[in-house]
Interface confidence: low
């Protein structure tokens, strides 16, 4: 039988009546067009919905948009279009929602051709009121909030000007012209690239990287010959053109661009690219594209300075620049990432790492699944996960993998079981231990979401036909109940729940179609009466993360420490609640070779924990460029993994000597950098 439909599944008592009393329909007085939905703030219950409708006329396109607001998690909506003077809002800019709980919202309006500048509507009270502001420029990008101060906004204009506001969009000042890309850094710093000659495209590889720490009063040029730049964790990266040819290299700074070091990564040619896959304050995952249009490259993981890199994974699937990669951070368990590799036979296989890129393995075959036609051996195969690449290829995959930091250990994804990803219709699989083991959760493709920090999982079948049934599970996907939320099926377009997975409300979005008209409709279901009591201590059980061998004293040690979590028992039907905080007890581990990455000039042979010298560097002095100085490295091949907290145990020797030689690697050294003030 299908998972969750056998006799062992206990039914949630009287759930139909409980859910019926908590199902709220809202029909939008709208012609169907597009709809976008944004949550304003955390735990506020405020949702903004923007519907837009385009009518192509002979000479021009006529557009109409409506704005709706809910303050009860989507149960009821009020039309507030009059607050924005019934203005047509540009959906390509979306709704710019302020950071944290600032309550700020910026909507960018469509204006007529001859106007001097654009128009925005601003709210700082969770969209209760809006102020119309005419801009002295036409925006090219959505307004970007400073992460530190939501009153500070930046935007690029269609004329490539960099505009800044210090009073939440009331007044704007152009602080620089000829700007290609601008990003907020930490402490209200702005980084941006500028062109000197023709345009961003023409000057690619000859751009300058600038920094302002005072919102445009003064500037510092922190890099030249720039192709592009990126921020990740505490690292600032720039890809820089080489002097002699058309190759470029990554340089990295950890002091906002004052000093730079060349990253020990391969250089790339014109057709190749670098991509920061993930970054935190400890380290970065960097993808380096292979030469040629191969569709794959290599993942490297950095040391704590972002300079020395270890090869992490070969043949990593990543289609051409700006293309698709399946790289996924499993946020429900520390150190876990999932991605795809392109094998020699051109099939795609899923790989998982549990130790932040140290080792990658195939996903274990789910116990309750058979190997499919892709498997050479019907008894030996793996689970392969569908992610962004499958979605881009229009496979029958409605959603990417899902995990939430406060639903510890839970990962939900579409997949197939075999030697590689199959193009056949996938099923939905769940892991409750961060990806170590998997179970088939639902037959066929579904939309899914996590509520109440994992206390409830909700799913809707992916179908081309109208639907009126929702499925839910209170035991991490083992058993499923079905609830008919409406008599009249709707064409389903999406599930919406508040980001953070703490809510107990789910909104089902879709449209109804009749002979003459179609309308947007939402059904919001509150599961609070299904989980009728608050969870108590007895509802939780101790779980050791990353446990693979309880016999082993070092069981659960990942990156030098292990963590015990209090997790909700699958059998407990109760509310974690909005204030639920993940309870974990960390414990430091003894150091082993697994806690060290291979240092510059060393590598790990497959299935070996020892680092050995790279043959081409044997007997050579290990020297590299650091902060514009030549450094000599004395090492026995190991460097502690960034973020690794182990103590005692193995302790390899490592020493770095300053050779007192300059090495600017064609990049600006600190003394050559210039500053200027406005």
């Amino acid at each position: 039988s299908a998972p969750g439909e056998d006799e062992e599944c206990g039914r949630v008592r009287d759930f139909v009546a409980k859910l019926a009393n908590n199902t709220h329909q809202h029909v939008f007085d709208d012609l169907r067009g597009s709809v976008s939905l944004s949550w304003v703030g955390d735990s506020t219950g405020v949702i903004l919905v923007l519907t837009t409708f385009h009518v192509p006329l002979v000479i021009m396109t006529f557009g109409q948009s409506k704005l709706y607001r809910s303050e009860d998690y989507g149960k009821n909506f009020k039309d507030i279009t009059d607050l924005i003077n019934n203005t047509f809002i540009r959906t390509e800019f979306g709704m710019a929602i302020g950071p944290e709980n600032s309550g700020k919202v910026v909507l960018t309006a469509e204006v007529s051709g001859g106007s001097r500048g654009g128009r925005i509507f601003r709210s700082s009270d969770f969209a209760k009121n809006f102020v119309q502001t005419d801009l002295p420029f036409h925006p090219l990008t959505q307004m970007m909030y400073s992460p530190q101060n939501s009153d500070y906004l930046l935007a690029l204009s269609t004329e490539n000007g960099l505009w800044v506001s210090k009073n939440f969009g009331g007044k704007w000042e152009e602080i620089h012209k000829a700007v290609c890309l601008a990003k907020w850094g930490s402490d209200n710093t702005i980084f941006f690239t500028t062109y000197a000659n023709g345009s961003c495209k023409a000057d690619l590889g000859a751009l300058e990287l600038w920094r302002t720490s005072d919102l445009g009063k003064s500037f510092k040029t922190i890099g030249v010959k720039i192709y592009s730049f990126g921020l990740g964790g505490r690292f600032l990266f720039a890809s820089v053109m080489a002097d002699k040819d058309t190759t470029r290299r990554i340089h990295v700074s950890t002091d906002q661009g004052d000093t730079w070091s060349m990253a020990q990564l391969p250089s790339v040619g014109q057709e190749q690219f670098y991509s920061i896959l993930a970054a935190n304050d400890d380290m970065v995952f960097m993808h380096v594209d292979e030469p040629g249009d191969t569709g794959f490259g290599t993942i490297f993981t950095s040391d704590d300075r972002g300079i020395v890199y270890s090869k992490s994974l070969d043949r990593h699937l990543y289609t051409t620049t700006g293309g698709e990669t399946d790289f996924t951070n499993v946020t429900s368990l520390r150190g876990v990432y999932i991605t795809s590799v392109l094998s020699e036979d051109n099939s795609i296989q899923t790989m998982i790492t549990f130790d932040q890129g140290g080792r990658w393995t195939h996903l274990r075959k789910p116990e309750n699944s058979e190997c499919d036609a892709t498997a050479k051996n019907k008894n030996e195969c793996s689970l392969h996960i569908h992610a962004s690449y499958s979605i881009s290829q229009k496979l029958n995959v409605p959603m990417a993998p899902l995990s939430e930091p406060n639903a510890v250990g839970i990962v939900i994804a579409h997949g197939s079981v075999g030697d590689a990803i199959s193009v056949m219709v996938p099923d939905v699989y769940i892991s409750d231990d961060g990806g170590y083991s998997w179970t088939k959760m639902l037959e066929g493709p579904h939309y899914y979401t996590i509520l109440d920090s994992g206390g409830i999982i909700v799913a809707i079948e992916h179908s081309s036909r109208p639907i009126n049934v929702i499925k839910f599970s209170t035991d991490e996907g083992q058993c499923w109940q079905t609830y008919t939320f409406t008599r009249d099926p709707i064409y389903f377009t999406g599930l919406a729940s508040e980001p953070g997975a703490r809510s107990m409300n789910i909104s089902i979005w879709g449209f109804t179609e009749s002979f003459l008209t179609s309308q947007w409709v939402s059904y919001t279901i509150d599961f609070k009466d299904i989980l009728e009591r608050n969870c108590e201590e007895k509802d939780y059980t101790i779980w050791l993360a990353h446990s693979t061998d309880p016999e082993d004293y070092e069981d659960g040690c990942i990156l030098g420490y292990k963590e015990q979590f209090l997790r909700l028992r699958k059998s407990s039907v109760c509310q974690n609640g909005r204030d639920y905080v993940v309870t974990k007890q960390p414990s430091i581990c003894l150091c082993s070779l697994e806690d060290f990455l291979c240092d510059f000039g060393y590598y790990r042979p497959e299935n070996d924990s020892k680092c050995v010298e790279q043959p081409e560097l044997k007997g050579h002095d290990l020297e590299f460029c650091l902060y514009g100085r030549e450094e000599h490295l004395t090492t026995n091949g190991y460097r502690k993994i960034p973020g690794d907290k182990c103590q005692g145990g193995v302790n390899p020797v490592r020493e770095v000597k300053d050779l007192k030689k300059k090495c600017t690697s064609n990049f600006l050294s600190p003394e050559k950098q210039n500053s200027k003030s406005n």
């Epitope: 050791l544 309880p550 004293y553 430091i588 003894l590 182990c646 103590q647 005692g648 302790n651």
Partner: antibody, heavy 121, light 109 residues
Framework: EVQLLESGGGLVQPGGSLRLSCAAS????????MNWVRQAPGKGLEWVSA????????YYADSVKGRFTISRDNSKNTLYLQMSSLRAEDTAVYYC??????????????WGQGTTVTVSS | EIVLTQSPGTLSLSPGERATLSCRAS???????LAWYQQKPGQAPRLLIY???SRATGIPDRFSGSGSGTDFTLTISRLEPEDFAVYYC??????????FGQGTKLEIK
């Protein structure tokens, strides 16, 4: 009540053998690593040997390696220490102790009352 | 091999006083794997502290543990008559699996 009860100690000549037993009660025996720790007269504590919950992994102090064998019978909730080629310096009170729970080292939280082994001619 | 050295060898104090016992490791020890035991004459040892600072079940709160790296301390805030005994620190390492300190004898002054 969680309890460990050692038996099998006694007087033995150098080069002789002895088998100690430890009967466990009041907890799920197979879930815990178990140890033998000894204390020579008037001296401090010395760890002798350890065994994992399933019995699949065993560990020994250098001083007893090759002479002592630790084992367990989870169906009988009993831990054993087979001692051979005994020496005068093996004279001590031998304690059976419970190791940490699964996943964490939480110290040796349960100790038996000890059994005395005397190696003398 | 990690060697644990306890000091002082003997500590003479009166009831009501504060006792501070030290345990120094020859190399860094993970605080998760350091424990303290109390042993009274003719009795088996009893676990007091594990993970360097966590009190075992039933241990009064006058006993506290602290430290990291190579230096660890057991503190008895206010000595009771039943606290006079021998105290051992212990670490779980790689080889040998466990090592104990030589002990500190806490006696009545």
């Amino acid at each position: 009540e969680v309890q460990l009860l050692e038996s099998g100690g006694g007087l033995v000549q150098p080069g002789g053998s002895l088998r100690l037993s430890c009967a466990a009660s009041g907890f799920t025996f197979s879930s815990y690593a178990m140890n033998w720790v000894r204390q020579a007269p008037g001296k401090g504590l010395e760890w002798v040997s350890a065994i994992s919950g399933s019995g699949g992994s065993t560990y020994y102090a250098d001083s007893v390696k090759g002479r002592f064998t630790i084992s367990r019978d989870n169906s009988k909730n009993t831990l054993y220490l087979q001692m051979s080629s005994l020496r005068a310096e093996d004279t001590a009170v031998y304690y059976c102790t419970r190791g940490r729970g699964i996943g964490y080292y939480n110290g040796m939280d349960v100790w038996g009352q000890g059994t005395t082994v005397t190696v003398s001619s | 091999e990690i060697v644990l050295t306890q000091s002082p060898g003997t500590l003479s104090l009166s009831p009501g006083e504060r006792a501070t016992l030290s345990c120094r490791a020859s190399q860094s020890v993970s605080s998760s794997y350091l424990a303290w035991y109390q042993q009274k004459p003719g009795q088996a040892p009893r676990l007091l502290i594990y993970g360097a600072s966590s009190r075992a079940t039933g241990i009064p709160d006058r006993f506290s543990g602290s430290g990291s790296g190579t230096d660890f301390t057991l503190t008895i805030s206010r000595l009771e008559p039943e606290d006079f005994a021998v105290y051992y620190c212990q670490q779980y390492g790689s080889s040998p699996m466990y090592t104990f300190g030589q002990g500190t004898k806490l006696e009545i002054k």
